[in-house]
Amino acid sequence: VEVQVSEDPVVALVDTDATLRCSFSPEPGFSLAQLNLIWQLTDTKQLVHSFTEGRDQGSAYSNRTALFPDLLVQGNASLRLQRVRVTDEGSYTCFVSIQDFDSAAVSLQVAAPYSKPSMTLEPNKDLRPGNMVTITCSSYQGYPEAEVFWKDGQGVPLTGNVTTSQMANERGLFDVHSVLRVVLGANGTYSCLVRNPVLQQDAHGSVTITGQPLTFPPEA
């Protein structure tokens, strides 16, 4: 028996269902009584789901897995994983035994989009050109860790005086907080882009500082 899986990782959004595809080619006259199918975590060998002795033995993994019972006889050994969590990420091995056996591993990559960034400015009043301000760009509930990029109003990348921190929340998703310290010009727009590297999703936030006096305050 030869087991086939997709070589590319399966990308699944948090809280959605994912299918880990696995197939084999049954011989003529094949019956499910001959089939031993085991899904397990590749690294720890923890049992996830199994079909043995002619019947579905059910989920051994938080009761969120299922096979496609009507398709097994056709060689479809795929596994359905419901309500995906970040902790589900990793490699899963599909092990098929009929007379002989074969196995193959499929990788599950979990992802969650980042929220539209919120921008805060400190100090946020009595600003003058030449003041040093702190701009914080915060985006929430994403996975995996984000990349953050800053630009000024002309689209020029701002790389100095940036501190980016990732804080995992209760669900293991990430909140990203990026702080830019910049000396104000007369007018200025500052943009942050939060990128999810797996989803190639970009979330944009910007702050425009206007209405300040256009001249620097007189020297004392």
Epitope: T120, T134, S138, N161, T163, S165, A168, N169, H177
Partner: antibody, heavy 117, light 111 residues
Framework: EVKLVESGGGLVQPGGSLKLSCAAS????????MSWVRQTPEKRLEWVAS???????YYPDSMKGRFTISRDNARNILYLQMSSLKSEDTAMYYC???????????WGQGTLVTVSA | DIVLTQSPASLAVSLGQRATISCRAS??????????MHWYQQKPGQPPKLLIY???NLESGVPARFSGSGSGTDFTLNIHPVEEEDAATYYC?????????FGGGTKLEIK
């Protein structure tokens, strides 16, 4: 040189309140997430709170509602307002500068809070 | 909450030998990118000091005799060769999800 100096600890009765301060120097205070971590008399370490900016804070469930973290970026000071204190809150309270993935890179010397009748 | 269990609670190691401290998490603190486990040293009367972050990265200024390894649920701090000044209590801490928690500590004595 990064320097964090806590103050405000002392003896307080159960149900009472206390406000701790942490004066920071030697780094750009406003750029960093700041945290409070405490150490019980049994030497157990517990994360208390973290703050990104004035409106972005994080707490463990056990501290929510009773403890409030805040900061004054103009004066480089971190605060921890504690209320409805219990004997279990007796600990050395440390101010810490958080690293980029929530480790605690720099610690102050701590201020001792004792909750007792 | 993720519970971190350190072992042993205490150990005595001869000068110049290897000290190995284990930290086991009640669930994985790793992703495909990082292991969110950190190690601290605390001497009597002093605050904790960061030694290792993200499982294996040596904090600036920390001697190279300290090293960290591990992923998933099992992590190790190694000190080799042990020096007299390494007598202290060592703590692990994770930052994989809220709340961030610490291990109970391992007290290292130098023989």
């Amino acid at each position: 040189e990064v320097k964090l100096v806590e103050s405000g600890g002392g003896l307080v009765q159960p149900g009472g309140s206390l406000k701790l301060s942490c004066a920071a120097s030697g780094f750009t205070f406003s750029s960093y997430i700041m945290s409070w971590v405490r150490q019980t008399p049994e030497k157990r370490l517990e994360w208390v709170a973290s703050i990104v900016s004035s409106n972005i804070t994080y707490y463990p469930d056990s501290m929510k509602g009773r403890f409030t973290i805040s900061r004054d970026n103009a004066r480089n000071i971190l605060y921890l307002q504690m209320s409805s204190l219990k004997s279990e809150d007796t600990a050395m309270y440390y101010c810490a500068r958080s690293g980029t993935r929530a480790w605690f890179a720099y610690w102050g010397q701590g201020t001792l809070v004792t909750v007792s009748a | 909450d993720i519970v971190l269990t350190q072992s042993p609670a205490s150990l005595a190691v001869s000068l110049g030998q290897r000290a190995t401290i284990s930290c086991r998490a009640s669930k994985s603190v790793s992703t495909s990118a990082y292991s969110y486990m950190h190690w601290y040293q605390q001497k009597p009367g002093q605050p904790p000091k960061l030694l290792i972050y993200l499982a294996s990265n040596l904090e600036s200024g920390v001697p190279a005799r300290f090293s960290g390894s591990g992923s998933g649920t099992d992590f190790t701090l190694n000190i080799h060769p042990v020096e007299e000044e390494d007598a202290a209590t060592y703590y692990c801490q994770h930052s994989r999800e809220l709340p961030y928690t610490f291990g109970g500590g391992t007290k290292l004595e130098i023989k």
